[in-house]
């Protein structure tokens, strides 16, 4: 069921002021401009659907051009509580407080929100990325230090009349790249409070949010150029499958990754590609404008539908899963890295997937919608697709039930 016309009140079809409010650099995430404090301090904030803290640089750091200066804000309130967030590689820590927050190219509202003022970090900020903080848009369950810290979007919905929904259109770089910068500029839109029909083509297809922590979904089938990987569908969701705008790659569980790469190799003339390419370490290049997209297969993920025994599929092109890498030495080459990688924490549908689609995070109805993005990079022969319905039985069995552990042992 596409549910195209049954929009709730407040879901206008056009959000002109929010269109094109995201910027970024290929592989370094998408950011939105936000203001914090009184008088307002402007910061660029990474949009991350894979975490739930609003955290901003609040101390000098070599990679930050600017940072949140709490002492200059008359509306800052200290919560007298620390927060520490370790990642597999790197970490950040800081002090919790609240302040007034708004999004200049967003809804015309100001809300009081929790803010983690980052005072110390390691391998978190990216040199030249142009963002100074992170906006975690997932649910309170994964907020740090615990689920009592209300995430920004919850505060926004609670304090205003904005509907409990947002949508993301991430527009990948493609070529030609901006020759004056080391990495290609990217753009996109974060629509807060609804759906903008100008940002997608065709129909929106919805998949249930399995559990409100990450934006967890269930993948029921995977195909490479129409060839089923034929794995137990539990493997696709081991130990979860999430939609995460803060991750660059499509990340797949080890077994699934190995099967997918084997299938991609078999479906394409890539016998001579260096092994390091498939590990995402080495690039491959072609003379500018001659990338043989046709030799690479499409990747299709089938997602659980809203109706029993019904699924739909989203299909991405090599234009999404080969990430353009600007080589500063020469502009005569189009170079790429393989942006599908291995994961030990389940499937992560990162920018590689999201750049093909307009993605609707319909929190009110506990579902995520996918439609073909009006800005996705494609060629004259193939396009990204969202298609359905397909009959798929026993989809509930595809979900993996994570054994309950002490949450403090979890790594982000």
């Amino acid at each position: 069921e596409t549910d195209e016309e049954s929009e709730e009140p407040g879901r206008r079809g056009s959000f002109v002021e929010m269109v094109d409010n995201l910027r970024g650099k290929s592989g370094q995430g998408y950011y939105v401009e936000m203001t914090v404090g009184s008088p307002p301090q402007t910061l660029n904030i990474l949009v991350d659907t894979g975490s739930s803290n609003f955290a901003v640089g609040a101390a000098p750091h070599p990679f930050l051009h600017r940072y949140y200066q709490r002492q200059l804000s008359s509306t800052y309130r200290d919560l007298r509580k620390g927060v520490y967030v370790p990642y597999t590689q790197g970490k950040w820590e800081g002090e919790l407080g609240t302040d007034l927050v708004s999004i200049p190219h967003g809804p015309n509202v100001t809300v009081r929100a929790n803010i983690a003022a980052i005072t110390e970090s390691d391998k978190f900020f990216i040199n030249g990325s142009n963002w100074e903080g992170i906006l975690g848009l997932a649910y309170a369950e994964i907020a740090r230090p615990d689920d009592s810290l209300e995430p920004f979007f919850d505060s926004l919905v609670k304090q205003t009349h904005i509907p409990n929904i947002f949508s993301l259109q991430l527009c990948g770089a493609g070529f030609p790249l901006n020759q004056t910068e080391a990495l290609a500029s990217v753009g996109g839109s974060m629509i807060i409070g609804g759906i903008d029909h100008s940002l997608y083509t065709g129909s929106l297809w919805y998949t249930p949010i399995r559990r409100e922590w990450y934006y967890e979904v269930i993948i029921v089938r995977v195909e490479i150029n129409g060839q089923d990987l034929k794995m137990d569908c539990k493997e696709y969701n081991y130990d979860k499958s999430i939609v995460d705008s803060g991750t660059t790659n499509l990340r797949l569980p080890k077994k699934v990754f190995e099967a997918a790469v084997k299938s991609i190799k078999a479906a394409s003339s890539t016998e001579k590609f260096p092994d390091g390419f498939w590990l995402g370490e080495q690039l491959v290049c072609w003379q500018a404008g001659t990338t043989p997209w046709n030799i690479f297969p499409v990747i299709s993920l089938y997602l659980m539908g809203e109706v029993t025994n019904q699924s739909f599929r989203i299909t991405i092109l090599p234009q999404q899963y080969l990430r353009p890498v600007e080589d500063v030495a020469t502009s005569q080459d189009d170079c790429y890295k393989f942006a599908v990688s291995q994961s030990s924490t389940g499937t992560v549908m990162g920018a590689v997937i999201m750049e093909g689609f307009y993605v609707v995070f319909d929190r009110a109805r506990k579902r995520i919608g996918f439609a073909v993005s009006a800005c996705h990079v494609h060629d004259e022969f193939r396009t990204a697709a969202v298609e359905g319905p397909f009959v798929t039985a026993d989809m509930e069995d595809c979900g993996y039930n994570i054994p309950q552990t002490d949450e403090s042992t979890l790594m982000t």
């Epitope: 003339s269 260096p274 390419f277 043989p292 020469t330």
Partner: antibody
Framework: EVQLVESGGGLVQPGGSLRLSCAAS????????IHWVRQAPGKGLEWVGW????????DYADSVKGRFTISADTSKNTAYLQMNSLRAEDTAVYYC????????????WGQGTLVTVSS | DIQMTQSPSSLSASVGDRVTITCRAS??????VAWYQQKPGKAPKLLIY???FLYSGVPSRFSGSGSGTDFTLTISSLQPEDFATYYC?????????FGQGTKVEIK
Amino acid sequence: EVQLVESGGGLVQPGGSLRLSCAASGFTFLGYGIHWVRQAPGKGLEWVGWISPAGGSTDYADSVKGRFTISADTSKNTAYLQMNSLRAEDTAVYYCARGPFSPWVMDYWGQGTLVTVSS
Amino acid sequence: DIQMTQSPSSLSASVGDRVTITCRASQDVSTAVAWYQQKPGKAPKLLIYSASFLYSGVPSRFSGSGSGTDFTLTISSLQPEDFATYYCQQFPTYLPTFGQGTKVEIK
């Protein structure tokens, strides 16, 4: 501008050794393969072997396997062809050529360097 | 090894003529075939790749066709600068091999 410049050719006695160099510029060295192709006087083209500078993997024609070794120095954007146990039939102009990993063709070539094996 | 047999080994033609060179592989190579042009004392130049794709900068009078074992290079209207030797090359999963060459001379 893409450029491949071979050097190191010359006269060598049968059983001797020679190392040819191929200096590359104007493209992303790590993003392509480098092939060696030879052409005996008045004859056709014969593929000798190739290297992926990024991964170091190599392949060789049966006629040179065990005698020739291809290597690359990525810091210098240079590929090498080490030729040992040379025979009279190895006399040829040796070309290095750039090739994408797929399709496996040679899209830019050097000017060639002549290797003469004679006593 | 896969053998590539070119025919004819040489041909004489006039400016404006349509010229066809064929290449036969000793086994199925799908469309993994390229064509090169070489002039005396010069390095070869890529003309066609993947059997029928014209390489960038190559004049449209050159075209390629074929799949499996039989391949053709066609020059629709021979120009003075086209007098040269032409080589086919196969490049499937195996090691690449070249045809013996076809010399196109002025009649």
